[in-house]
Interface confidence: low
């Protein structure tokens, strides 16, 4: 029951729904990423904070990363339930005192997102949405530029290699 050499309990990272997702999809996805645990046997379930009901969720395969494992689970919540606190409950034999690890997902303020655009209060939400879209655009633009750079580098390298080969052949003759 005790791991002497290292802490191999699941290490959680949480991902909250984006404003864009909640605005466009009328729902939000909570994602719970669990890393660096051993052994691979792990149980994950989701509940609302003040309820014992287990909610329907999905999970990825348990993946080996070096000497430990990782897994992720996600819960899609309808817009009406986004204002409730949710819990990702993780059961693993190396949770340090053997008790279930409870990862709290804070409520999402959907009222800020769904306000009338004419309302001044919604300006921040719209700005945030715009910022998110801008960031996403910037991200893809960056990837595109990176891809172009790789292609240019490949072409130049190829040209240089051919030129070198040509020069060398010239010297030999």
């Amino acid at each position: 029951d005790k791991q002497l050499d290292a802490d191999v309990s699941p290490k959680p990272t949480i991902f909250l729904p984006s404003i864009a997702e909640t605005k466009l999809q009328k729902a939000g996805t909570y994602l719970c990423l669990l890393e660096k645990f051993f052994p691979d046997v792990i149980k994950i379930h989701w509940q609302e904070k003040k309820s014992n009901t287990i909610l329907g969720s999905q999970e990825g395969n348990t993946m080996k990363t070096n000497d430990t494992y990782m897994k992720f689970s996600w819960l899609t919540v309808p817009e009406k339930s986004l204002d409730k606190e949710h819990r990702c409950i993780v059961r693993h034999e190396n949770n340090k005192n053997g008790v279930d690890q409870e990862i709290i997902f804070p409520p999402i303020k959907t009222d800020v997102i769904t306000m009338d655009p004419k309302d001044n209060c919604s300006k921040d939400a719209n700005d945030t949405l715009l910022l998110q879209l801008t960031n996403t655009s910037a991200y893809y633009m960056y990837l595109l530029l990176l891809l172009k750079s790789v292609v240019y580098f490949a072409i130049i390298t190829c040209c240089l290699l051919r030129r070198t080969a040509f020069c060398c052949n010239g010297e030999k003759s």
């Epitope: 014992n52 949770n95 340090k96 005192n97 053997g98 008790v99 279930d100 409870e102």
Partner: antibody, heavy 118, light 107 residues
Framework: QVQLQQSGPELVKPGASVKISCKIS????????MNWVKQRPGQGLEWIGR????????KYNGEFKAKATLTADKSARTAYMQLNNLTSVDSAVYFC????????????WGQGTLVTVS | DIQMTQSPASLSASVGETVTITCRAS??????LSWYQQKQGKSPQLLVY???TLAEGVPSRFSGSGYGTQFSLKINSLQPVDFGNYYC?????????FGGGTKLEIK
């Protein structure tokens, strides 16, 4: 406020068995480990074992494996500990206690049940 | 099993004094240590968990510190209600053993 209510004192004869109970006041009974702790008169605390009422999973301190049996009734929100083949060294106060947090200790304790073997 | 050694076994102090109780683990337990107070005939009460986090409702004159194998519980400005027995307990794996206890008495 969560409360753990334990059964009353027991006076038992050597060689007999006793079953003590611990009822919890809140709905999360199934989702928390219920622990049992022994305290002999004027002595320190010893962890006996724990049960996860949700699926009946149990873990025991090696020293108590042959002595204690932990069970739980989810519908009654009650945990039980049966002590077998009692001798004078089993005379003690037995506490139930609940682990509430991943990084914490025993947050809630029962008031204790005195078992006297005589 | 991990052994928890608590010292001193008993301690006399006056109201208003500051006292420190120490606890040593036989191996590295990181921060997985709790402190409890127990009054005569009562059940233990959680004071500190995860080495230095005060449990709900515990006065700020109590503080926990330490990491790995060496831990301490400090009580500033002792109050009459603080007298009783104190126990440390590790919860790094099983079994979660307790220290032998420290009896804090009024001088």
């Amino acid at each position: 406020q969560v409360q753990l209510q334990q059964s009353g004192p027991e006076l038992v004869k050597p060689g007999a068995s006793v079953k003590i109970s611990c009822k919890i006041s809140d709905y999360t009974f199934s989702n928390s480990w219920m622990n049992w702790v022994k305290q002999r008169p004027g002595q320190g605390l010893e962890w006996i074992g724990r049960i996860y009422p949700g699926d009946g999973d149990t873990k025991y301190n090696g020293e108590f494996k042959a002595k204690a049996t932990l069970t739980a009734d989810k519908s009654a929100r009650t945990a039980y500990m049966q002590l077998n083949n009692l001798t004078s060294v089993d005379s003690a106060v037995y506490f139930c206690a609940r682990w509430e947090r991943y990084d914490g200790g025993f947050t809630y304790w029962g008031q204790g049940t005195l078992v006297t073997v005589s | 099993d991990i052994q928890m050694t608590q010292s001193p076994a008993s301690l006399s102090a006056s109201v208003g004094e500051t006292v420190t109780i120490t606890c040593r683990a036989s191996e590295n337990i990181y921060s997985y240590l709790s402190w409890y107070q127990q009054k005569q005939g009562k059940s233990p009460q959680l004071l500190v968990y995860y080495a230095n986090t005060l449990a709900e409702g515990v006065p700020s004159r109590f503080s926990g510190s330490g990491y790995g194998t060496q831990f301490s519980l400090k009580i500033n400005s002792l109050q009459p209600v603080d007298f009783g027995n104190y126990y440390c307990q590790h919860h790094y794996g099983l079994p979660p053993t307790f220290g032998g206890g420290t009896k804090l008495e009024i001088k």
